[in-house]
């Protein structure tokens, strides 16, 4: 057989036995001559051992470049490949010789004691036990122990080859401590040497770099990268690093095994790469590869090297953030910088501190945004090394879906006297202001809330046939006034009013307000009654501790049995937008009240008096009257609101001012409180008395000093007092210039 590529001028060495395989018996002489065209050498099995004393290589007597190999009394162990080759080339001729020794069918190893086979238990992996044969066609099985198992060739993955040995799937013998080959010749068993089985791991579970990402340094700093490989047991690991600047003077690599807990099914290996002073050329990808021979796993990270410390805002930094009330707002501070900057947030110039509602860090998070969060937020980045600062302003606009103020104030069951003109109001607060407020209506009987009809929170009305107020056929004549804008409780609100010219039919009215972030609606139950009429004496809205009388007046010829009730707490709360059950049909929720009856020529008047009204007296009061003929009950409901007592407060400050003689001074002092406070003015702690030059108007709210004189200079005090106390503000008026002489002088 020929091995190697023939050169242009050289022929292959020629053997005297022109066969690939030669079979001879033991104890005979093996002699092969090799001829060629230049210096030749022989290689034979075991020729690295001491057996060459038996092997004789001689020069041929009949020519140059010829050598004869002779082995007298060959034994089984001489089985193998015999190669004749030209020195310093790959050109060779090979013959495989079987020395049939039936007493020793397996070729013994060099040590003749035992061999070692290394196996890995990965998928589709076979192992070769090198029990070579001196006979080519033996029936060989493999014995493994302990426990004892015998494996015979199955024609595929289990096989024996005299030149190679016994091949078997690794997993089949991984349990064994030792294996050997066995051949049967004429009922006689022959065994190879023993092979110790060593299971070698190969699995690498993972390779982790630390730090794993976002590594940034500036020139001159030290880089330390740790690469940890986790493997199964019985594994050895080789680490290999790839990095941008391979010819680094200050590079240091340290590899070591890490201790793992006893009983752990895992090993850990660590490789540490250190570069003492990085340069710009050290920027780039760093890759750590861990190899176990059968498996390689790698991991990479990018190292960024900056010329010097710096800080800047990233291009994605927002300048305007829009949100709706109740949302979570996140404003990230997007920056470029090394090292990471210190981040400080300010709102309208005031530093923000984190609490349960706001988190001020890399990201400014407002958990549930409210209107008061609207404003300008400034983020200041400070580089911790260079102290360089960068600032950026973010405007936060908080939108509010339409909220209708009266929703929470007005009872949904007020009654209105037949034929009267009534005004219904929706006061809408929204940011941005509503782009429209529309009114709708429908007849009360079309939407009667019968208990049999299913009403849910998602569909509060059994009828949804709302009609536009432009189409008032069959209903009350309506006029919608142009929207008004008013500053109420310090907020710009939109007021939409609907005027019912004559209250003729009971209906439901709905106002719907819409802006860019939502909608709000209010349903008003407009119940028209021809029955009793309720009035309040002396005031529509009494204050706590004041007395109030509720008068129920009914035509004596039509009605009888006038009774006052108070609507008690609902056993089931009315859901938003749900229609209440008509009170006359459900007297269970009413509390009967004591009242006094008076009469005049045409009417009965039932008066219910509340002395020292309290906040608990607020609620819906029902006057019930019975039709004398039909005995049908008529109810009128009036909501009573009791105003809370509030101590006086003065809104706005009096400003110190300087005025020239002869000019005028006008100042105002607006006070609020309940009961409304009395306003008094003082000059230098003396009560200010009106005269021709000093004018007090609007319940003393406005003070005017005409043609000021030098003696008008001084400390002016506005004091607002009620039974609940006083509030005051002060200002100093300076009068400049020389006093003009008057004519009288």
């Amino acid at each position: 057989a020929s091995v190697g590529l023939p050169s242009v001028s050289l022929d292959l060495p020629r053997l005297s036995i022109q066969k690939d395989i030669l079979t001879i018996k033991a104890n005979t002489t093996l002699q092969i001559t090799c001829r060629g065209q230049r210096d030749l050498d022989w290689l034979w099995p075991n020729n690295q051992s001491g057996s060459e004393q038996r092997v004789e290589v001689t020069e041929c007597s009949d020519g140059l470049f010829c050598k004869t190999l002779t082995i007298p009394k060959v034994i089984g162990n001489d089985t193998g490949a015999y190669k004749c080759f030209y020195r310093e080339t790959d050109l060779a001729s090979v013959i495989y010789v079987y020395v049939q020794d039936y007493r020793s069918p397996f070729i013994a190893s060099v040590s003749d004691q035992h061999g070692v086979v290394y196996i890995t238990e990965n998928k589709n992996k076979t192992v070769v036990i090198p029990c070579l044969g001196s006979i080519s066609n033996l029936n060989v099985s493999l014995c493994a122990r302990y426990p004892e198992k015998r494996f015979v060739p199955d024609g595929n993955r289990i096989s024996w080859d005299s030149k190679k040995g016994f091949t078997i799937p690794s997993y089949m013998i991984s349990y064994a401590g030792m294996v050997f080959c066995e051949a049967k010749i004429n009922d006689e068993s022959y065994q190879s040497i023993m092979y110790i089985v060593v299971v070698v791991g190969y699995r690498i579970y993972d390779v982790v770099l630390s730090p794993s990402h976002g590594i940034e340094l500036s020139v001159g700093e030290k880089l330390v990268l740790n690469c940890t490989a986790r493997t199964e047991l019985n594994v050895g690991i080789d680490f290999n690093w790839e990095y941008p600047s391979s010819k680094h003077q200050h590079k240091k690599l340290v590899n070591r095994d890490l201790k793992t807990q006893s009983g752990s099914e895992m090993k850990k290996f660590l490789s540490t790469l250190t570069i003492d002073g990085v340069t710009r050329s050290d920027q780039g990808l760093y890759t750590c590869a861990a190899s176990s021979g059968l498996m390689t796993k790698k991991n990479s990270t990018f190292v960024r090297v900056h010329e010097k410390p710096f800080v800047a805002f990233g291009s994605g930094m927002e300048s305007l953030v829009e949100a709706t009330v109740g949302e979570r707002v996140r404003i990230p501070a997007k920056y470029l910088g090394y090292p990471p900057p210190e981040i400080k947030w300010y709102k309208n110039g005031i530093p923000l501190e984190s609490n349960h509602t706001i988190k001020a860090g890399h990201v400014l998070t407002i958990m549930e945004v409210s209107e008061r969060d609207t404003g300008n937020y400034t983020v200041i980045l400070t580089n911790p090394i260079s102290k360089e600062k960068q600032s950026h302003v973010v405007s936060l606009v908080v939108y509010v879906p339409p909220q209708i103020g009266e929703k929470s104030l007005i009872s949904p069951v007020d009654s209105y006297q037949y034929g009267t003109t009534q005004t219904l109001t929706c006061t809408v607060y929204a940011i941005p202001p509503p782009h429209h407020i529309h009114w709708y209506w429908q007849l009360e009987e079309e939407c009667a809330n019968e208990p049999s009809q299913a009403v849910s929170v998602t569909n509060p009305y059994p009828c949804e046939e709302w009609r536009s107020v432009e189409d008032f056929q069959g209903g009350n004549k309506i006029e919608v006034n142009k929207n008004q804008f008013a500053l109420i409780e310090g907020k710009n609100k939109t007021v939409s009013t609907l005027v019912i010219q004559a209250a003729n039919v009971s209906a439901l009215y709905k106002c719907e307000a819409v802006n860019k972030v939502g909608r709000g609606e209010r349903v008003i139950s407009f119940h028209v009654t021809r029955g009793p009429e309720i009035t309040l004496q002396p005031d529509m809205q009494p204050t706590e501790q004041e007395s109030v009388s509720l008068w129920c007046t009914a035509d004596r010829s039509t009605f009888e049995n006038l009774t006052w009730y108070k609507l008690g707490p609902q056993p089931l709360p009315i859901h938003v937008g749900e229609l209440p059950t008509p009170v006359c049909k459900n007297l269970d929720t009413l509390w009967k009240l004591n009242a006094t009856m008076f009469s005049n020529s045409t009417n009965d008047i039932l008066i219910m008096e509340l002395k020292n009204a309290s906040l608990q007296d607020q609620g819906d009061y029902v006057c019930l009257a019975q039709d004398r003929k039909t005995k049908k009950r008529h109810c009128v409901v009036r909501q009573l609101t009791v105003l809370e007592r509030v101590a006086p407060t003065i809104t706005g400050n009096l400003e110190n001012q300087t005025t020239s003689i002869g000019e005028s001074i006008e100042v105002s002092c607006t006070a609020s409180g309940n009961p409304p406070p009395q306003i008094m003015w003082f000059k230098d702690n003396e009560t200010l008395v009106e005269d021709s030059g000093i004018v007090l108007k609007d319940g003393n709210r406005n003070l005017t000093i005409r043609r000021v004189r030098k003696e008008d200079e001084g400390l002016y005090t506005c004091q607002a007092c009620s039974v609940l106390g006083c509030a005051k503000v002060e200002a100093f008026f300076i009068i400049e210039g020389a006093q003009e002489k008057t004519n009288l002088e």
């Epitope: 998928k123 198992k149 494996f151 199955d154 024609g155 993955r157 690794s170 997993y171």
Partner: antibody, heavy 115, light 110 residues
């Protein structure tokens, strides 16, 4: 050698167990797989039981079949047969570490599922 | 995994060459865990090739296999009448549960 048995006509939903009996094969060294073939259709690998008794099923077969073994037999239980399970079921010898190689097959046993 | 065999059926004259392709939806384990089987009517399948290209014992050397990863080929050169059968490829994967046969290719010998 390998031989399957237990194939018969069953009604849908009635559990059925097929048995594969081996001789001259050491089940503590070899893995055994079950493969089926619907009439006029191709082969479908069902699952394998390893020499150590671990089982693995084709993704489509999980929950529908159970494989178990003794020292000389390997069972395939069809938990709740449907008409789609009508097929010839083969038992084949393979290797723990090489699921996609079967070098000894049984002749097969026919299962018919019909109401 | 899905193994797609093409073409089917395939027709060949005695002495001709037949090539059957098998494409896998994902790479087989070790790029070579693919075997080929021959099945004749009424008989169980018979192993022809494993490890994509290793001839099973007792199989004539006119059968050969090639390919790696996702594309594999079974070639029958010098087709004989006895080669008329259906041929299946079988792939093994990282996850044993993905093991699957191809749909089969019927070889008709004229």
């Amino acid at each position: 050698s390998v031989e399957e048995s237990g194939g018969r006509l069953v009604t849908p939903g009635t559990p059925l167990t097929l048995t594969c009996t081996v001789s001259g094969i050491d089940l503590s060294s070899y893995a055994m797989s079950w493969v089926r073939q619907a009439p006029g259709k191709g082969l479908e690998w069902i699952g394998i039981i390893s020499s150590t008794g671990n089982t693995c099923y084709a993704n489509w077969a999980k929950g529908r079949f159970t494989i178990s073994k003794t020292s000389t037999t390997v069972d395939l239980k069809i938990t709740s047969p449907t008409t789609e399970d009508t097929a010839t079921y083969f038992c084949a010898r393979g290797y723990d570490d090489y699921v996609a190689l079967f070098n000894m097959w049984g002749p097969g046993t026919l299962v018919t599922v019909s109401s | 995994a899905v193994l797609t065999q093409t073409p089917s059926p395939v027709s060949a004259a005695v002495g001709g060459t037949v090539t059957i392709k098998c494409q896998s939806s994902q790479s087989v384990y070790n790029n070579n865990a693919l075997s080929w089987y021959q099945q004749k009517p009424g008989q169980p399948p018979k192993l022809l090739i494993y490890d994509a290209s290793t001839l099973a014992s007792g199989v004539p050397d006119r059968f050969s296999g090639s390919g790696s990863g996702t594309q594999f080929t079974l070639t029958i050169s010098g087709v004989q009448c006895d080669d008329a059968a259906t041929y299946y490829c079988l792939g093994g994967y990282d996850d044993d549960a993905d093991t699957a046969f191809g749909g089969g290719t019927e070889v008709v010998v004229k």
